[in-house]
């Protein structure tokens, strides 16, 4: 599948997941907390203030780093999965905190969490998985 299609498909799936999560959690535009979002890399579910959300590294990094091994399972496609089964000490896990000021930046940043190798196939086609 062409990279743009994968990108758009993941984004569309994310927006659907967020909508379902909003319904489940009773979230609306005026609710306190952090709205679910697609950050152009991965999908973040809505969260209450004080909540830390954990996600597995997105598929993007598996393409950049095919030899990278993650100890955590991928979050399911049909929902946000059980983030309780993820641990920040695991390689391949990224977190964001929901604060009264909104979402924090990812911790660790994606490259550090997901084992990005900047010298891997610098001109290879996989550059364009998301980056085209």
């Amino acid at each position: 599948m062409h990279s743009d299609c994968i990108f758009k498909k993941e984004q569309a799936m994310c927006l659907e997941k967020i909508q379902r999560a909003n319904e489940l959690m009773g979230f609306n535009d005026s609710s306190p907390g952090c709205p679910g979002m697609w950050d152009n890399i991965t999908c973040w579910k809505p969260a209450h203030v004080g909540e830390m959300v954990l996600v597995s590294c997105p598929e993007l990094f598996r393409i950049f780093n095919p030899d990278q091994v993650w100890e955590t399972e991928t979050i399911g496609e049909s929902d946000f999965g059980d983030s309780n089964s993820l641990d920040l000490s695991d390689m391949g896990v990224v977190s964001r905190n929901c604060t009264e000021d909104g979402w924090s930046e990812p911790f660790p940043h994606y490259f550090d969490a997901c084992g990005f190798d900047e010298y891997e196939s610098e001109t290879g086609d996989q550059d364009y998985y998301y980056l085209s």
């Epitope: 152009n40 930046e105 911790f107 940043h109 994606y110 550090d112 998301y130």
Partner: antibody, heavy 120, light 107 residues
Framework: QVQLVESGGGVVQPGRSLRLSCAAS????????MHWVRQAPGKGLEWVAV????????YYAESVKGRFTISRDNSKNTLYLQMNSLRAEDTALFYC?????????????WGQGTLVTVSS | EIVLTQSPATLSLSPGERATLSCRAS??????LHWYQQKPGQAPRLLIK???QSLSGIPARFSGSGSGTDFTLTISSLEPEDFAVYYC?????????FGPGTKVDIK
Amino acid sequence: QVQLVESGGGVVQPGRSLRLSCAASGFTFSRFAMHWVRQAPGKGLEWVAVISYDGGNKYYAESVKGRFTISRDNSKNTLYLQMNSLRAEDTALFYCARGYDFLTGYPDYWGQGTLVTVSS
Amino acid sequence: EIVLTQSPATLSLSPGERATLSCRASKSVGRSLHWYQQKPGQAPRLLIKYASQSLSGIPARFSGSGSGTDFTLTISSLEPEDFAVYYCHQSSRLPFTFGPGTKVDIK
């Protein structure tokens, strides 16, 4: 090796505009976020702006919001900072730095800077 | 925005002595706190990432600790080339910010 070379600095009058450039080499530019950080003479570092790998996300310090615009041309491996309505307090050495991430990251490699002097 | 405060502003020490630099954040930044060294006429250099993670090429005498709002950079035994200005930087919340710096000079 990673190399970042800033250009476009100079002396400019208050209220005028200037565009800084940063030429990147030694890494896959299109995969990395990029930052601008400035340093007034004899002062500390001040974070100015960051742009994500594809230019889709841009964030600014309050002191420059609405006046400065960060942009990039991945086909030319070049980062830009368009500075409008310049003030005396914008006088500084402007560094471009690579962000170690797709989205923002922390600056890990820095250029040598280009000096902007705002004076009448 | 998150304000970073560094202390002391200046630290006067002799080569071989231990340097302890402090950085305090106005709100929790978790461990998204990084340390930079800047020598006169040079660009900053990344020393420590995520409060305590060392980087290749950085001497082992540099170490970091802390989380939340209080962080420390320690130089176990100062070498002549370590006399410089040190900045902390948070990448937890936008807009990102730097501390005002601590100058380590020769006593």
